[in-house]
Amino acid sequence: GGTAEKEEEIKPDQPFSGPLPGSLPADHRPFFAPHSSGDQLSPSQTGRSHPAHTATPQMTSAASNLLPPVAFKNTIGRIVLSEHKSVKFNCSINIPNVYQETAGISWWKDGKELLGAHHSITQFYPDEEGVSIIALFSITSVQRSDNGSYICKMKVNDREVVSDPIYVEVQGLPYFTKQPESVNVTRNTAFNLTCQAVGPPEPVNIFWVQNSSRVNENPERSPSVLTVAGLTETAVFSCEAHNDKGLTVSKGVQINIKVIPSPPTEVHILNSTAHSILVSWVPGFDGYSPLQNCSIQVKEADQLSNGSVMVFNTSASPHLYEVQQLQALANYSVTVSCRNEIGWSAVSPWILASTTEGAPAVAPLNITVFLNESSNNLEIRWTKPPIKRQDGELVGYRISHVWESAGTSKELSEEVSQNGSWAQVPVQMHNATCTVRIAVITKGGIGPFSEPVDVAIPEHSRVDYAPSSTPAPGNTESM
């Protein structure tokens, strides 16, 4: 059988035709034994016979050597056709009657048996000398996956007979195995794009297209690497793969020029304390380059514009930062900027943030403690310390008194309203020591406790010593 190098020279779309093998008598009608669903196909011209894998009869008589070996007749060899066309081909074999045991013909492609939904059919033409068998195979709409080497196999007297291969080449438009990928590049910096496509038919030639215009006037054989010297603005690239069937165009990929990010938006203060603010923001467009870090700038809003700016750097994610070490009850202006590999974004619009009142920094002064035996109370007095505006509005005082006697200890506290400067505390135990400390409470929180003042509480008898006290700062007089 000849091979057809020229496209579709074999005429695979034609029906099977030609004389039946073995010069069968006209009155012998074929028997059909389909392998699977398929059209009934008429037998094909099979060409000249020559042995492929052959079988000889298993006989002991000397006559067995005179019998011809069994072999498939020569196949068509090679079929070249276009995608989506139909193709039909066959194998044929003559089995003399001396061969008692034969199995059906099976079709194999690239070493694997074809089972199931393939359109194959077997025709039997018996006569006095034996039987001619034709195995017919058809594919209604060929695809690239049908490319390959097809063979017939048959078992004759436990020997496997194999036909010559039928090579099917399905030709179509080029098929991309590698398409260009979108990249983000630095302005005026070289970069590469890659494109690869295959046939058949080969060769496949590549043209590059930038913004709908060809880059190269002469094609490059696939695969092709396009080196772009540099871009100053966004461009769309694609590649065209050309072969003798036509051309296929890859997806268009956008090549973006990296720029500085856009400024962050939606800067908010999520939470404020006396000395910190929690800042959140939404990152702006990243400029086609990942954000690396962000900068939060804070300045006192009440000062003139030349006031010093505090800068706090943080990672780009999460989009949240707690600015600490701020003054209480103060107003600040806040802005955020982020950077990528190209540079820093412009700053976001400044927003106002305020810290809350702080806890007072001073303790009450001039604390005195006096035991009133008649009422069995401790009388405690103090003077209000100087409280700054940022310490917050005075709410009251907290009095801590700890009682200790013979290994037992009891800690109690009282709160008194802002107007008071004295308090009475019931005696909790006798023959004990009471330690008193007082702290200022403002809306900003509780301040530090004063230095402790100790009072000795005797058995139920008169107190014969002066009251305990803490002097005001700078005052060394005993009370």
Partner: antibody, heavy 122, light 107 residues
């Protein structure tokens, strides 16, 4: 100046054969792909066949309507293009143009002959 | 196969007019669209290739545009010698196919 001159047209009976020729001059014939295009009376243009240059192994393409009946060939030494037409049918009646492919992979037919008339009739 | 459609089969215009002839492909042909002029004597000439490139020797009053599936040929200032039939053709894949033609006549 590019010149393409067709010949070989005429009257032929259905199922008959005819061979068209095209003599090319004024350009380097062997580097160009060549085509045949036809136009039936009162109809539009119909591409028929292409043959590529030697560098592309003389690969051929055909319209489905003529596949297996027509064969395109060339003789670079003589700067000749041929179209062998077998099993002609009445619908093959047309003016047949020999055409040069503009190349550079733009797939445009840049120079056309004046055409030769083929009539298939009994 | 790719179908090429020229919806207007004939067109009347006056000398000096701006004339546009359109052509539509049944699928994206990626600018592989060519325009031809056929005179009454049967002579065929290439005018525009690759959608918008002017073939050598063609007057600049001819221009082509389009992309994807829709293309057009424009004659900016119609002259007597432009009276002809105009065909579009796709070269993206075989078989190459032509539009049905648009016959341009003088009013």
């Amino acid at each position: 100046e590019v010149q393409l001159v067709e010949s070989g047209g005429g009257l032929v009976q259905p199922k008959g054969s005819l061979k068209l020729s095209c003599a090319a001059s004024g350009f380097t014939f062997n580097v160009y792909d060549m085509h045949w295009v036809r136009q039936a009376p009162g109809e539009g243009l119909e591409w028929v066949a292409r043959i590529r240059s030697k560098s592309s192994n003389y690969a051929t393409n055909y319209a489905d309507s003529v596949k297996d009946r027509f064969t395109i060939s060339r003789d670079d030494s003589q700067s000749m293009l041929y179209l062998q037409m077998n099993n002609l049918q009445t619908e093959d009646t047309a003016i047949y143009y020999c055409v040069r492919d503009g190349s550079h992979y733009y797939y445009a037919l840049d120079y056309w002959g004046q055409g030769t008339s083929v009539t298939v009739s009994s | 196969d790719i179908q090429m459609t020229q919806t207007t089969s004939s067109l009347s215009a006056s000398l000096g007019d701006r004339v546009t002839i359109s052509c539509r492909a049944s699928q994206d042909i990626n600018n592989y669209l060519n325009w031809y002029q056929q005179k009454l004597d049967g002579t065929v000439k290439l005018l525009i290739y690759y959608s918008s490139r002017l073939h050598s020797g063609v007057p600049s009053r001819f221009s082509g545009s389009g992309s994807g599936t829709d293309y057009s040929l424009t004659i900016s200032n119609l002259e007597q010698e432009d009276i002809a039939t105009y065909f579009c053709q796709q070269g993206k894949m075989f078989p190459w196919t032509f539009g049905g033609g648009t016959k341009l006549e003088i009013k």
